[in-house]
């Protein structure tokens, strides 16, 4: 029950990120004008990744395309790049993990099959966030240093007497949305990968009949030690109990969420 | 087609208050700012303030901010501009626009201070 | 605030002859954002509201004359009437549209010599 919860979990939190690295890559405020210098500008300037727009006195907002692909910034590629890798690398997880929860079924997968696809999914998810929060972060880091960098030359002569203040730009929403975005993105795909080993199958359990010889308290059980699946070997040797005779020490010895450490 | 239309001339005396309406039809009222503007008697255009119907933000000249209230009620598209404490300087016609590069102007309301 | 100023106050010119009127800002109106310049000129006749002839210092709105032209860029701005027509006589304003308040000149009344 508890595996399923994470799964689902998981699920639910990456789709959320991946609609928000999506919205983020779509959205144009990536950078808005810096109005410390300017609160009074009537004229409102704002980029993201795909285009630029300004906001007039009137209240009407003309965008512009950036239609060109050589004449853009390497870093402005270089995030494109990863956010369009993020999304697709979440799609594709989303597509796998769909498969992989536990609450559906398709024909007769087996728990292993759901378990790799789980793990499969998380990585993904993991990576989508990594891409995402990476992309943002870059992106950030080049607003600050052209912000410094136009601070130092914040007034460039214009013919000569007059004064012309440069625009800056600052944080636009749309990085704080792919900096959340990202982190949700990359928690659901922790969950999945928590998920995954609480889906690995077990070897047949054989029903265990308990010898006490006296004087000891060792259980003796034939066949009773865990095969290691791949997710999470089993190298404490725990025992398995499956409804058979059962022992004093029993209580503390059900399988549990705990078991798969 | 674009239309502002202005509320008629008023008369008014000093100290009291005038509420001049704007009524826009022709585009989405909710997709541009209105402007307020001052035309003295023989005199040049001043800038008021404008209100945006849209999100009700405003954004008004200094010299009118104590004693102008810029409104607007989007269910019958129309913007308001209230002018308090009236002096007989505030004799002028008042104009409303809207549009790209203001492309939109009432017809003009002439409000009259006199005592 | 920025500070518009209009030259000359007034202008006889003779029907058919080029008009020109400038304006002056007190500080630049170019936005580097879409590198354009954020002027606004206006007609006005008597009785009527101002009209609209140029946007972005440069841009005809649409229905108005070829014969006006706007030109100019940061302070220093031009409206020009190639052939003057008995119909363009009229106060013609500038307007800053890039900062707030926004501000007019005190425009230039235009006649028939």
């Known amino acids: 029950m508890a595996v399923t919860a994470c799964q689902g979990l998981g699920f639910v939190v990456s789709l959320i990120g991946i609609a928000g690295i999506i919205a983020a890559t779509c959205m144009d405020q990536w950078s808005t004008q810096d109005l410390y210098n300017n609160p009074v500008t009537a004229v409102f300037n704002y980029q993201g990744l795909w285009r630029s727009c300004v906001r007039e006195s009137s209240g009407f907002t003309e965008c512009r395309g950036y239609f060109t692909l050589l004449g853009l910034p390497a870093m402005l590629q270089a995030v494109r790049a990863l956010m369009i890798v993020g999304i697709v690398l979440g799609a594709i997880g989303l597509l796998v993990s769909i498969f992989a929860l536990k609450c559906i079924r398709i024909g007769s997968m087996e728990d292993s099959a759901k378990a790799n696809m789980t793990l499969t999914s998380g990585i993904m998810f993991i990576v989508s966030g990594l891409c995402a929060i990476a992309g943002v972060s870059v992106f950030a880091n080049m607003l600050v240093t052209n912000f410094w960098m136009s601070t130092a030359n914040m007034y460039t002569g214009m013919g000569g007497m007059v004064q012309t203040v440069q625009t800056r730009y600052t944080f636009g929403a749309a990085l704080f949305v792919g900096w959340v975005a990202g982190g949700l993105t990359l928690i659901g795909g922790v969950m999945m990968c928590i998920a995954c080993r609480g889906l690995a199958p077990e070897e047949t359990n054989y029903k265990a009949v308990s010898y006490h010889a006296s004087g000891h308290s060792v259980a003796y059980k034939p066949g009773g030690f865990k095969a290691s699946t791949g997710f999470g070997s089993n190298t404490k040797n725990k025992k398995i109990y499956d409804g058979g005779a059962r022992t004093e020490d029993e209580v503390q010895s059900y399988p549990s969420k705990h078991d798969y450490v | 087609q674009v239309q502002l239309v202005q509320s008629g001339a008023e008369v008014k005396k000093p100290g009291a208050s005038v509420k001049v309406s704007c009524k826009a039809s022709?585009?989405?009222?909710?997709?541009?700012?209105i402007h307020w503007v001052k035309q003295a008697p023989g005199q040049g255009l001043e800038w008021m303030g404008y209100?945006?119907?849209?999100?009700?933000?405003?954004n008004y000249n200094l010299k009118f901010k104590d004693r102008v209230t810029l409104t607007s009620d989007t269910s019958i598209s129309t913007a308001y501009m209230e002018l308090s404490r009236l002096r007989s300087d505030d004799t002028a016609v008042y104009y409303c626009?809207?549009?790209?590069?203001?492309?939109?102007w009432g017809q003009g309301t002439l409000v009259t201070v006199s005592s | 605030d920025i500070v518009m100023t209009q030259s000359p106050d007034s202008l006889a010119v003779s029907l058919g002859e080029r008009a020109t009127i400038n304006c002056k800002s007190s500080?630049?109106?170019?936005?580097?954002?879409?590198?354009?310049?954020?002027l606004i000129w206006y007609q006005q006749k008597p009785g009527q509201p101002p009209k609209l002839l140029i946007y972005?210092?440069?841009t005809r709105d649409s229905g108005v004359p070829d014969r006006f032209s706007g030109s100019g860029s940061g302070t220093d701005f031009t409206l020009t009437i190639s052939s003057l027509q008995a119909e363009d006589v009229a106060v013609y304003y500038c307007?800053?549209?890039?900062?707030?308040?926004?501000?007019f000149g005190g425009g230039t009344k235009l006649e028939i010599k």
């Open positions: 626009a809207t549009g790209r590069g203001f492309a939109y």
């Open positions: 209100i945006s119907p849209g999100n009700g933000g405003s």
């Open positions: 307007q800053n549209d890039y900062s707030y308040p926004l501000t």
């Open positions: 022709g585009f989405t009222f909710t997709s541009y700012n």
């Open positions: 500080q630049s109106l170019f936005n580097s954002g879409n590198q354009k310049n954020y």
């Open positions: 972005r210092a440069s």
